[in-house]
Interface confidence: low
């Protein structure tokens, strides 16, 4: 593996070469963690402490802000409860989603009293509207956590908010909720560690199963404590959970509870020299690469190790067909003298738990009509026995010999002279961004990773907690506790002044145009353009 970056740029070098624009935060704010990209309006909305920002995608120095603090009473209540006045007793924005054409929906911790509201953004970008609906505040329980330290994953579709969060002051009652909309709120089973066991939610995504929207599923990515017997000692497992979009809860024991919730373990590991696999279990971030077929996005996951002794990070790729295969496989069941987890061998009730009510797979019209045996089975068998293994059964990127860990990932699919390449932008806990290209070898999923760039994007080392990529603007946006940074996806001119250097870089964004290393456009009919991503061979492509 080529672990030395082709380019390593310090913050100073990034500034001097005009390759980074930074918003260094406001004195009375912090925690620029919640991002919402709006390519149509050319805005990046950012939720932070007591503020929501609207940044211009062209240049983040141009921004509008909404101040949304908590009342003195709320702040005092929070303080009396023994919380930190600066780090906890404020309104940390945790949810920021597009509600409709004219409004966003935002939720914050509200000084341990979660609160939500709508933000008016107008019909058109030129309306230049960005204001809080002061008259319409809603209870944020089950939408935002009480504690700003806790992670939340949310998704707003068709006026309904799906969120994975903690629903209580103590931060013990974790659940996946569906709120808003016209239906009764639905949640995962309460106080049942088989469903969720102290989870840390990462993200939520809507993925179609078929051409019938009734089959649409919401997938949650999270990490959680492994259940006793599943693993010796205390361990973390990365998970993917599924819920049918048209799940309206069941009857009796699952009234207002999900009936189609299932979860499976995501494996990201490398074989060790002693025959014991090294597991990267701490899922940190997920990116879905939608290309051609929206039903089958490629899932990119960023993982770190749980161990304090051995620190490492990895990126694993998963296919949705593998995920679906696992959800159609055996359920995990506790049995035997040691009460350990085994694949369930008994009769699975019909319709199979986890199947969405629809015409496609037949059977039933609503989850409320599910037979008792399906409800009972679903309630006690939320986990699948088989895990989901990554494509090629191993990570595509591994970093173990460094003083940092991966925290975030976004991926861009780039057209190059010799094919399409996925370029990963990986954020770290020290404020650097790695730009990595995965290059297919014999088969498209057998990949070689090439580290193109390592860029420091913040003045002080600070963990990157949010990232968005704009293909339209060809820019990357990065969030941390300290502020927001913006950088171009490519810096072709920095690779050098010769064709060979440009070709050796193996950056799919760049090609030698006869006089300089510049942005490669597949549509440009230039016979002189030299680029070789697969092999990085200048001898064949450069005549100078």
């Amino acid at each position: 593996k080529n672990n030395v970056p082709r380019l390593k740029l310090s913050y100073k070098e990034m500034l001097e070469s005009n390759n980074v624009i930074t918003f260094n935060g406001l004195a009375n704010s912090s925690s620029y963690h919640t991002f919402l990209l709006d390519e149509e309006r050319s805005r990046l909305y950012v939720g932070a402490k007591d503020h929501i920002f609207s940044f211009d995608l062209v240049n983040i120095k141009d921004f509008q802000k909404i101040v949304w603090p908590v009342s003195y009473t709320r702040r005092d209540e929070c303080k009396w409860a023994g919380k930190d006045i600066l780090k906890e007793c404020a309104n940390f924005i945790k949810v920021l989603k597009a509600y409709n054409q004219t409004h966003l929906y935002a939720c914050g911790t509200g000084a341990f009293h979660p609160i939500c509201t709508y933000i008016e953004i107008g019909h058109h970008p030129e309306d230049n509207i960005f204001k809080l609906e002061n008259s319409h505040f809603e209870n944020g329980r089950g939408k935002s956590p009480y504690d700003p330290k806790l992670l939340t994953a949310s998704l707003l579709i068709d006026g309904e908010l799906y969120s994975g969060t903690a629903a209580d002051f103590m931060g013990r009652d974790f659940a996946i909720f569906r709120t808003l909309g016209h239906h009764h709120p639905i949640r995962t089973e309460q106080h049942d560690s088989r469903w969720l066991n102290d989870p840390k939610f990462i993200s939520a995504h809507l993925i179609s199963e078929s051409d019938n929207p009734e089959d649409d599923k919401v997938y949650f990515f999270f990490r959680e404590n492994a259940i006793d017997g599943e693993h010796s000692g205390k361990a973390t497992h990365a998970r993917i959970g599924q819920i049918c979009k048209n799940d309206f809860g069941g009857h009796r024991s699952l009234v207002n509870k999900w009936t189609t919730f299932l979860k499976a373990r995501l494996i990201c590991s490398v074989p060790g020299p002693n025959g014991i696999d090294t597991h990267f279990d701490e899922l940190q971030d997920v990116f879905l690469m939608n290309f051609k077929d929206p039903k089958n996005p490629v899932v990119y996951g960023v993982f770190t190790t749980s161990s304090n002794i051995f620190k490492g990070s990895a990126v694993c790729m998963y296919s949705m067909s593998d995920v679906r295969r696992v959800f159609l496989g055996p359920y995990a069941h506790r049995d035997g003298p040691n009460y350990q987890w085994v694949p369930y061998q008994g009769r699975v009730p019909y319709p199979r738990p986890g199947t969405c009510p629809s015409k496609t797979f037949g059977g039933f019209d609503s989850t409320k009509d599910l037979p008792d045996d399906v409800i009972t089975f679903a309630r006690s068998h939320p986990a699948m026995y088989n895990p989901v293994f990554p494509m090629n059964n191993r990570p595509i990127v591994i970093k173990t010999d460094v003083n940092y860990q991966f925290t975030q990932i976004v991926v861009d699919r780039v057209d190059a002279e010799d094919g399409q390449y996925d370029v990963m932008f990986i954020g770290t806990d020290v404020g650097t961004v790695l730009k990595v290209v995965s290059i297919p070898k014999e088969t498209w999923y057998d990949l070689e990773e090439v580290l193109l760039e390592e860029m420091t994007v913040f003045r002080e080392p600070t963990a990157i907690s949010a990232m968005e990529l704009s293909t339209k603007q060809q820019q990357l946006y990065i969030g941390s506790t300290a502020g927001v940074a913006q950088l171009p996806l490519h810096r072709c001119d920095i690779y050098g002044k010769a064709c060979a250097e440009c070709c050796l870089a193996r950056d799919p964004y760049c090609a030698w145009d006869g006089s300089a290393c510049s942005r490669y456009f597949p549509t440009a009919k230039r016979a002189t353009r030299a680029q070789d991503i697969r092999n990085g061979d200048p001898l064949t492509h450069c005549s100078d």
């Epitope: 209580d168 002051f169 103590m170 009234v255 207002n256 009972t376």
Partner: antibody, heavy 116, light 111 residues
């Protein structure tokens, strides 16, 4: 048919101990959280304690914290309540109840009398 | 002193409609499901209403539950003599991490 049958109640001196049992049948015991609820003579219901289906978590009312211990044996379909340092105010009928977001089934109760 | 507040007594004549109230706070009724229990003289309590307004099978549709904000109520229509009992509301309390009951309402069927 769901059945819950409590036993182990009786007369005990202040400071003494008792162990209540609740035998469950008619449902998959290991799938459900279970609870104890008590009712002092002529008074209302008071929740005492509850336990996860797998004993993973246990919760107690402040009035019994540190004195009572809830436990279960899923292989025997039995719920227990170990009561130590008993006080006169612990005198009540103790009901075992199946938890399903609420107490959907109750036993007939067993009377515990603490005399001074 | 119960966490949930119920009137100590209520009464009605056969055929009448009676409502029993139960008030709490945002940490219990406001954000959690409410249940109602019926306790006939000398017997164990029985679940009457769960998840605010749902009836378990076997409970007559004369019994109905509703909730608004931090208050809940149980309505009994077409009152019958066999409805004479103690009625308790209950809910999970997030701040106490425990289940709380109302003090109970003794329903008397007159005449």
């Amino acid at each position: 048919e769901v059945q819950l049958l409590e036993s182990g109640g009786g007369l005990v001196q202040t400071g003494g101990s008792l162990r209540l049992s609740c035998a469950a049948s008619g449902f998959t015991f290991s799938d459900y959280a279970m609870s104890w609820v008590r009712q002092a003579p002529g008074k209302g219901l008071e929740w005492v304690s509850w336990i996860y289906y797998d004993s993973g978590s246990k919760y107690y009312a402040d009035s019994v914290k540190g004195r009572f211990t809830i436990s279960r044996d899923n292989s025997k379909n039995t719920l227990y309540l170990q009561m130590n340092s008993l006080r006169a105010e612990d005198t009540a009928v103790y009901y075992c109840a199946k938890l399903n977001g609420d107490f959907d089934y109750w036993g007939q109760g067993t009377l515990v009398t603490v005399s001074s | 002193q119960s966490v949930l507040t119920q009137p100590p007594s209520a009464s009605g004549t056969p055929g009448q409609r009676v409502t029993i109230s139960c008030s709490g706070s945002s940490s219990n009724i406001g954000n959690n499901d409410v249940s109602w229990y019926q306790q006939l003289p000398g017997t164990a309590p029985k679940l009457l209403i769960y998840a605010d307004s749902h009836r378990p099978s076997g409970v007559p549709d004369r019994f109905s539950g509703s909730k608004s904000g931090t208050s809940a109520s149980l309505a009994i229509s077409g009152l019958r003599s066999e409805d004479e009992a103690d009625y308790y509301c209950g809910a999970w309390d997030s701040s106490l991490s425990g289940y709380v009951f109302g003090g109970g309402t003794k329903l008397t069927v007159l005449g």
